[in-house]
């Protein structure tokens, strides 16, 4: 059960309710564990993890990435800018996580868990950011057409896209986790 779900607190006797910071930290680590499992299946069934042709597929993707200007790195850290970037980035990743559904055979449930846990994480972060400026949500129409486009790719590109999404999401979450620990 993901840390964000109510049964977590009920299931553990004498467990205090998780604090907001602890919920966020545990949620990210839970998602990262899920990504590791998905990457294992991806790397086992194709040679994408060793491929040098990633640039070809990356041209079709606009995956969220942490940049210096986002204020999430130690140099140039800005907690408010960074928190907005984390939430915006996670919202942008949602379409890619939707794409990952049905991309896994033995880890289908894990892919669903990563998707659902990310939604919960976004909710936690939005609570933390309640005093910050409004966060822009991706346009549903744009997301729908992107999803269609990704699903229409040939098999090799779909495998490569899956690998790139998982790798990018892992990197994004790791950067987010480091930054959020200061907040």
């Amino acid at each position: 059960v993901p840390p964000g779900e109510d049964s977590k607190d009920v299931a553990a006797p004498h467990r205090q309710p998780l604090t907001s910071s602890e919920r966020i930290d545990k949620q990210i680590r839970y998602i990262l564990d899920g990504i590791s499992a998905l990457r294992k299946e991806t790397c086992n069934k194709s040679n994408m993890c060793e491929s040098s042709k990633e640039a070809l597929a990356e041209n079709n993707l606009n995956l969220p990435k942490m940049a210096e200007k986002d204020g999430c790195f130690q140099s140039g850290f800005n907690e408010e800018t960074c928190l907005v970037k984390i939430i915006t980035g996670l919202l942008e990743f949602e379409v890619y996580l939707e794409y990952l559904q049905n991309r896994f055979e033995s880890s289908e449930e894990q892919a669903r868990a990563v998707q659902m846990s990310t939604k919960v994480l976004i909710q936690f972060l939005q609570k933390k950011a309640k005093n910050l400026d409004a966060i822009t949500t991706p346009d549903p129409t744009t997301n729908a057409s992107l999803l269609t486009k990704l699903q229409a790719q040939n098999q090799w590109l779909q495998d490569m896209t899956t690998h790139l999404i998982l790798r990018s999401f892992k990197e994004f979450l790791q950067s987010s986790l480091r930054a959020l620990r200061q907040m």
């Epitope: 553990a12 467990r15 604090t19 602890e22 545990k26 480091r178 907040m183």
Partner: antibody, heavy 119, light 106 residues
Amino acid sequence: EVQLVESGGGLVQPGGSLRLSCAASGFTFSPFAMHWVRQAPGKGLEWVAKISPGGSWTYYSDTVTGRFTFSLDTSKSTAYLQMNSLRAEDTAVYYCARQLWGYYALDIWGQGTLVTVSS
Amino acid sequence: DIQLTQSPSSLSASVGDRVTITCSASISVSYMYWYQQKPGKAPKLLIYDMSNLASGVPSRFSGSGSGTDFTLTISSLQPEDFATYYCMQWSGYPYTFGQGTKVEIK
């Protein structure tokens, strides 16, 4: 040299106020969360409070909530602990500490400043 | 709040001895840290996130454990290691500390 220097401690009567300062030097202050930890004479360590690098989020122990306020002046690379309604049980050496970037560990500590609450 | 119980509260050992200090948490914790404190001085970080050695800390110090049971080991005690050791946990706020273990010269 990376260091934190606390000041502002002293003798104060119960119910009184005191403001502690923690001046940072030798590192860029802006990305780090800061903490206060105290140690009563001959006793163990007790965490008091944390402030995020830009001051947007503060966290306090139950024993000081509503009485202590943590603030920052990033232009001076200084953290402050405003202590009101002081009690005898607040008597302790107060340490400020820096939180290690990307972790929850407290990696750099000041030498401490003694606060004595007594009539 | 999460309670941390260290054992022993104090111990006597000789230079070269292998020393083990344990820290038991009242419930499972997310992160565990170990600090060394000498009289009149500030605490010094030794171990973070259960087992990572802090910068500048000699490799004779090591940390292990998970869940509720954690251990600090000094593989070969040196004269400068006589001090009080504290475990500290973070699983949300507040951070809490163990009561300390004083390592004295036998």
